[in-house]
């Protein structure tokens, strides 16, 4: 576990002049930033959007845009952008920084947001290292920033996967946690306020109860976007009382241009129609040249370069910008209790014993509907079924012609003839038997069992060859 930290130093026109904003501001503005982290893109599967996490900065100071030229450097929000990560730090990652402008005019539906710049870079970074500085151009804009990844105790190391242990031989006792990296002792974790939610609360100082995003209340038991009166269970309900419903995050639909709003913990998400983009679907000037299709999506433009775009998304992604991972297993494509695995590039079904097929649709134990061709019969057993084929046929479904002479069954130069009931051997002079296996003595008496009555040596010997082909 740990935190990725991003510090924006400046954002303004790059060398070579002031960029002309594609959006005309009608009043005071302020900036904010969004950071998105993805693991280094693997060769096997496309990663889900911002799989390592994302964060929004606070809003920066209000400024008024001059139509002639923007300020040399636009005023920035205070503080770091922090993206906590729960698992190991991957080392190689994609860093996406978006600069957004919020117009504070008198628009209906609240402020208008527009995306000014977006930089995407793949980076290699070890956790615990110093701040790494960078300067990136996005069109005519220039963004200067620093970033680092740091582990949160007890995790240490370049990937935050090692746990710090005391150097002394004795391990930490009950109720104690491992030491800080350079200390040779154990420390007790802070005791949170009594009743603080184990699920939604945490503390860094004894006696406090800090809430995870989306939860509130003294003990972090109240969801932020509660839309109806909630009586809390437990001893605190009498003191907490009933939460008065505030406006839900989707009230009044903050999504512009026909976007649909869905609530998320403590916030909302807009699903934008074709041709629109942004946190509130407010950006309409985006074309394919802006690269709006994420996760390998292909941008298909309209008849002219300035017309609206659509994104053709790779399998496994959806949304107007291919920004949402499809939970294809939720459609329960695997039949007969099979386990669904979404590999990113394809679906796989792991079938229960006795079932097979891409979607576990074949019941191996079931002869019902199982067609064995050419007179074959279906035989169940051993957790599978098979076809027992009639003479002259083989293969999984008895559809293949089987040549009984292919194995050269007639000994001593006998000639083999296929027959509806099997095969017939025409023996060379001096031999007899169903497969010409017995030599004939000079006096015409066989040394082994005699030929069937009425059959002279050298006559064709008919041998009913019951050679069933069993295929699992």
């Amino acid at each position: 576990a740990g935190v990725f930290e991003l510090q924006i130093h400046s954002f303004g026109p790059g060398p070579g002049g002031a960029p002309r904003s594609p959006y005309s501001a009608r009043g005071p503005c302020r900036l904010f930033f969004r950071v998105c982290l993805k693991p280094g893109l693997s060769e096997e599967a496309a990663e889900s959007p911002c799989a390592l996490g994302a964060a929004l900065s606070a809003r920066g100071p209000v400024y008024t845009e001059q139509p002639e030229a923007p300020a040399p450097d636009l005023p920035l929000p205070n503080g770091l952008l922090q993206v906590p990560f729960r698992d190991a730090w991957p080392g190689t990652f994609s860093l996406i920084i978006e600069t957004w402008r919020e117009e504070l005019g008198d628009q209906i539906g609240g402020p208008a947001w527009s995306l000014l710049a977006r930089v995407t870079r793949r980076r290699r970074l070890a956790a615990g290292g110093p701040w790494a500085g960078d300067i990136q151009r996005a069109g005519a804009w220039e963004l200067r920033f620093s970033y680092r990844a740091r582990c949160e105790l007890p995790a240490v190391g370049t990937a935050c996967t090692r746990l710090c242990r005391p150097r002394s031989a004795s391990r930490c006792g009950p109720g104690l946690r491992p030491c800080a990296p350079l200390e040779d002792e154990c420390e007790a974790p802070p005791v949170c306020r009594a009743g603080c939610s184990l699920e939604h609360g945490f503390c860094e100082q004894p006696g406090e109860c800090r809430c995870l995003e989306g939860w509130t209340g003294p003990l972090c038991m109240v969801p932020v976007s509660t839309s109806s009166c909630l009586g809390l269970r437990g001893p605190s309900s009498t003191t907490t009382g009933c939460l008065v419903p505030g406006p839900g995050p989707c009230d009044g639909n903050p999504c512009a241009n026909g976007g649909s709003c869905s609530e998320t913990p403590g916030s909302f998400e807009c699903t934008c129609p074709r041709g629109f983009y942004g946190l509130r679907c407010e950006v309409s000037g985006v074309t394919c040249a802006d690269g709006p299709c994420f996760n390998g999506g292909l941008c298909v433009g309209g008849a002219d370069p300035d017309s609206a775009y659509i994104c053709h998304c790779p399998p496994g992604f959806q949304g107007s910008n291919c920004e949402k991972r499809v939970d294809r297993c939720s459609l329960q494509p695997c039949r007969n209790g099979g386990l669904c695995l979404d590999l990113g590039h394809a679906l796989r079904c792991r079938c229960r014993a006795g079932f097979a097929g891409p979607r576990c649709e074949h019941d191996l134990n079931d002869c019902a509907g199982r067609a064995c061709a050419n007179g074959g019969t279906c035989v169940e057993g051993g957790g599978a079924h098979r076809c027992s084929c009639a003479l002259g046929f083989g293969g999984r479904d008895c559809r293949e012609r089987a040549d009984p002479c292919a194995a050269r069954p007639c000994a001593h130069g006998g000639r083999c003839y296929a027959h509806f009931s099997g095969l017939v051997c025409a023996c060379a002079p001096g031999y007899m038997g169903a497969r010409c296996e017995f030599p004939v003595h000079p006096d015409g008496v066989s040394a082994l069992p005699a030929a069937p009555p009425g059959l002279r040596p050298g006559d064709p010997q008919r041998y009913p060859h019951h050679h069933h082909h069993h295929h699992h």
């Epitope: 690269g291 390998g296 990113g344 590039h345 891409p358």
Partner: antibody, heavy 118, light 108 residues
Framework: QVQLQESGPGLVKPSETLSLTCTVS????????WSWIRQPPGKGLEWIAY???????NYNPSLKSRVTISLDTSKNQFSLQLSSVTAADAAVYYC????????????WGQGTMVTVSS | EIVLTQSPGTLSLSPGERATLSCRAS???????LAWYQQNPGQAPRLLIY???SRATGIPDRFSGSGSGTDFTLTISRLEPEDFAVYYC?????????FGGGTKVEIK
Amino acid sequence: QVQLQESGPGLVKPSETLSLTCTVSDNSISNYYWSWIRQPPGKGLEWIAYIYYSGTTNYNPSLKSRVTISLDTSKNQFSLQLSSVTAADAAVYYCARVFHWGFAFDIWGQGTMVTVSS
Amino acid sequence: EIVLTQSPGTLSLSPGERATLSCRASQRVSNTYLAWYQQNPGQAPRLLIYGASSRATGIPDRFSGSGSGTDFTLTISRLEPEDFAVYYCQQYGTSPLTFGGGTKVEIK
């Protein structure tokens, strides 16, 4: 590993319609986009069209008025039809699978040469 | 459409040498959606690089890709005999999908 096999006539008369079929060796036809690309003798590659089992298609604008791409999941096949062919359409035609991480092509058929002549 | 121009047209090198191939786009290739292919005579192309810098499965690490925006590079750090072939770049950020004209790497 999945394999792709193109099939169709190697000789087409001018003004007629070229029809090619690509057979996918496994049952993955519903998991990927599938595409046709061509290469005139001694020249470079030209993308023609792609299709997804959901019905999504996309065509190269330079050929769109003459091209139809279709897909048959039951046969694990997809097909290309190019109408009103001329000598300029003579090429090696490849079918290919679209990569799962973007619209590049990770599996290709061996290609089939199509000659246009009367 | 985005036009991709590859240079040089032909590159004459010896085995063991380093090859640097260039692909320049007429406009920005969004999200570094650029691929490289290798094609031997009489064979279909083979995907080498996608996303400008990610090697496809089974591709040796002597092949590497770099670049963003409009300028992209394929580097073969040490040429092996089987590397002498034609190389194509392809952008897949904006429809229509387009290929470069190719660079032939031949034995000097």
